[in-house]
């Protein structure tokens, strides 16, 4: 028997769609071989209608597709706008139609229920609104208008123009009679329930002259959209519930084993702690639609999600919903990277951010997740060089190491830097990732002066002490600007007294500016790295003043002043709302810090080349 499996019988009605899922053993060969859907003819031949290689027969053009899910060992054939002619015997299979692995499927398309002549069919999702149109003749204009529901052989009054409302429809139905000249009345039913399904009768007037119109109301439960995303990646749920609920509180919830739905996030400020730091509810558009982004996907995030609207911010029967079934693929294309990076106060972190390697030209961004209200992620830095003002001199986004990873360095850490940060690009949104920065006890490994004043025209020498554990690392000095950190010549000066326990392996690397110019003013970083992988950094601000005393200055840590106060975020800086995550081009509106100039002049000396054992943190 064939190892391919699927539904043996599929039945539907004209105008509907079917989604036929076929299962196959997910061997390497099976995953990549041709998949097909064919119809068996009288001759026994099976004529291909649609295949995974892109073929679609003329009969199926514009209404059918075949999607392969190799990681699951399934493929799905979707066929829309069914007609009676689609009834027949089919095969779903792998390889060649005549001798591949296949499964027989019988499709039966019926006419649907027999409805009275002239019946209008309304197909609406549960929780939505329907407007039933009821025409009448002029002589019935002044007479009673009514809507009945047919239950078996009886008709139950639902609403009439004499203000009667059936208790089952209380607070969610209204009958509208237009002004003179318009010979139609309407009945609007909101927040449709499954129990509203059925045949209705509009009536105007009574006796033999009355006007009647039949309406068949089909209330559908929304079938979940299947969403397959990679472990560690990101998913976006787009929720469009209609204008009727534009001003009602919105929510996303996850169905639990008790068949209730636990709120994941809502617009009333509630958020499940399991999603802390990795969820945003994007502000809704005028039409009431909104989206929820979840990053750092875990296997336990799998499940059925519903979005909806209700004043309580949680699921209630009869209100509109949308549904998704999220599957998290463990064979992820997104590489493992630390979800937590630790640093010490005064120290630094280097965060590795993955991106889709096929999109090396995409713009890269780093933002700070804020949990207030629905969550948002104001942009801090981007690859084009924009840096938020209060991060001047201590934040840089580097394209290295490249090939699917960029680096973000943040130094001069304080406890206020603890929190969740997102890595993202303006390309593939599924590659958004989250990293948490934690500030732990400890001392920075690199020691530099806190604040240096250089004299115009003189020589300035800035020392950077590093412990023996970094002796094999490559050391560098660079001048920070809002477009990156330009490497400068530096000099290895042998043993240092800053780390008494480290004997001769404790070293110092110095930066010499000779002669000091006005352009040299700004932030300088001392750092260690291995190839394109960055380790710790330390920052020092150099102020330049007019010549007062002759001779060169050598600054040692003992004489260092405190680092200058950071500039406060200008109230004019627009915080990038979550919406910018959808379209990172909006980030360009963020206020730009003025470029702090070209690389300073200086004499190049020997630089240690080394190997690095840790990325990111200032302590083990």
């Amino acid at each position: 028997k064939s190892p391919v499996f699927g539904p043996q019988e599929v039945s539907s009605v004209e105008g509907n769609s079917v989604s036929i899922k076929c299962y196959y053993p997910p061997t390497s060969v099976n995953r990549h071989t041709r998949k097909y859907w064919c119809r068996k003819g009288a001759s026994g031949r099976c004529i291909t209608l649609v295949s995974s290689e892109g073929y679609v027969s003329s009969n199926y053009a514009g209404r059918a597709n075949l999607t392969n899910f190799p990681e699951n060992g399934t493929f799905v054939v979707n066929i829309a706008q069914l007609s009676r002619d689609d009834s027949g015997h089919y095969k779903c299979g792998l390889g060649i139609n005549s001798r591949g692995l296949s499964f027989d499927v019988s499709l039966e398309v019926s006419q649907g229920p027999e409805l009275p002549n002239g019946t209008e069919v309304y197909t609406v999702d549960v929780g939505r609104t329907v407007t039933i149109k009821c025409p009448f003749k002029t002589e019935n204009a002044p007479k009673t208008k009514a809507l009945y529901k047919k239950i078996g052989q009886t008709s139950v009054l639902v609403i009439d123009s004499r203000n009667y409302v059936n208790p089952n429809y209380k607070d969610r139905i209204r009958l509208r009679i237009p002004g003179t000249g318009q010979l139609i009345f309407t009945v609007v039913i909101d927040r449709l329930r499954l129990s509203d399904h059925g045949l209705y009768l509009c009536q105007a007037g009574d006796g033999s002259n009355r006007d009647e119109k039949n309406a068949d109301l089909q209330v559908l439960e929304p079938e979940p959209e299947l969403v397959y995303e990679d472990l560690r990646g990101s998913v976006t749920f787009h929720c469009a519930l209609g204008l009727e609920v534009a001003n009602v509180a919105k929510f996303l919830c996850r169905v639990n084993s008790r068949e209730t739905c636990d709120v994941v996030i809502n617009t009333l400020g509630k958020r499940d702690s399991a999603f802390e730091g990795r969820i945003l509810l994007n502000p809704q558009d005028k039409d009431g639609s909104f989206s929820v982004v979840i990053t750092g996907l875990r296997k336990e995030d799998e499940g059925r999600y519903l979005c909806g609207a209700h004043s309580d911010g949680q699921l209630q029967e009869g209100w509109p919903i949308q549904a998704w079934q999220l599957f998290v693929n463990e064979e992820s294309t997104i590489p493992r990277s630390p979800t937590v990076v630790k640093g010490v106060a005064g120290g630094s972190v280097a965060v590795l951010c993955p991106y889709n390697p096929k999109e090396s030209q995409s713009l890269k961004y780093w933002c700070l997740w804020e949990g207030a209200q629905n969550g948002r992620c104001p942009l801090l830095v981007e690859s084009q060089g924009l840096v938020q003002e209060q991060y001047e001199g201590r934040l840089s986004l580097l394209q290295e190491p490249g090939n699917g990873t960029f680096t973000v360095i943040l130094n001069q850490l304080t406890t206020q830097d603890a929190g969740f940060y997102w890595c993202l690009t303006n390309g593939d949104t599924r590659w958004r990732t989250t990293v948490e920065i934690k500030i732990i006890e400890g001392e920075p490994n690199l020691k530099v002066p806190g604040n240096v004043t250089a004299v115009l025209g003189e020589t300035l020498n800035i020392p950077c002490h590093f412990p023996c554990k970094f002796s094999s690392y490559e050391k560098y000095w660079c001048k920070w600007s809002n477009t990156g950190c330009q490497t400068l010549p530096s000099q290895d000066e042998g043993p240092s007294e800053a780390f008494v326990n480290c004997d001769e392996n404790s070293r110092l690397v110095s930066l010499t500016l000779n002669p000091v110019t006005r352009a040299d003013e700004g932030w300088y970083w001392c750092g260690v790295k291995q190839g394109h992988f960055y380790g710790e950094t330390a920052a020092v601000y150099v102020a330049v003043e007019e010549k007062k005393v002759a001779g060169s200055r050598y600054v040692s840590p003992a004489k260092a002043d405190a680092a200058p106060d950071e500039k406060v975020l200008d109230s004019g800086v627009r915080e990038i709302e979550n919406k910018a995550i959808q379209d990172p081009r909006l980030f360009a509106e963020e206020k730009v810090v003025a470029d702090t100039g070209d690389q300073a002049g200086g004499s190049r000396a020997s630089v240690d080349s080394s190997s690095s054992e840790e990325q990111g943190g200032s302590s083990k």
Epitope: F5, P7, Q8, E9, V10, S11, S12, V13, N16, S17, V18, S19, I20, Y23, N72, T74, G112, Q218, L220, E221, E223, P224, L226, V255, S257, E259, T260, C261, R304, L306, Q325
Partner: nanobody, 126 residues
Framework: EVQLVESGGGLVQAGDSLRLSCAAS????????MGWFRQAPGKEREFVAT??????????YYADSVKGRFTISRDNAKNTVYLQMNSLKPEDTAVYYC?????????????????WGQGTLVTVSS
């Protein structure tokens, strides 16, 4: 919570027919499929048949061993699924379990189903 109650089991002769019913009650937010599994003494629980639905579209799945003899159907209004078993064989003897769930994956897999009934015994004598 969803409760499933099976009925219709019993003792029959080989070649006879039997109709099993499974009534679902409670909130069924994630129920898009209901099916039947069976477990013969000393054997693993195995897939028999499942019906999945979406609006007015039904998808019926059967195990090879029962194809052409068993028919699965449902009554939407009563929230009930039936298994019509014809041409019964002694090897069909087992406890038949009703199962319900989202069933978005392979319907033959037990963990696709969130809810299970207590089972009803079908004995086919030769």
């Amino acid at each position: 919570e969803v409760q499933l109650v099976e009925s219709g089991g019993g003792l029959v002769q080989a070649g006879d027919s039997l109709r099993l019913s499974c009534a679902a009650s409670g909130r069924t937010l994630t129920t898009y499929g209901m099916g039947w599994f069976r477990q013969a003494p000393g054997k693993e629980r195995e897939f028999v048949a499942t019906i999945k639905w979406s609006g007015s579209t039904n998808y019926k799945y059967y195990a090879d061993s029962v194809k052409g003899r068993f028919t699965i159907s449902r009554d939407n209004a009563k929230n009930t699924v039936y298994l019509q078993m014809n041409s019964l064989k002694p090897e069909d003897t087992a406890v038949y379990y009703c199962a319900a769930g989202t069933v978005l994956g392979d319907p033959r897999v037990l963990n696709e189903y969130d809810y299970w009934g207590q089972g009803t015994l079908v004995t086919v004598s030769s």
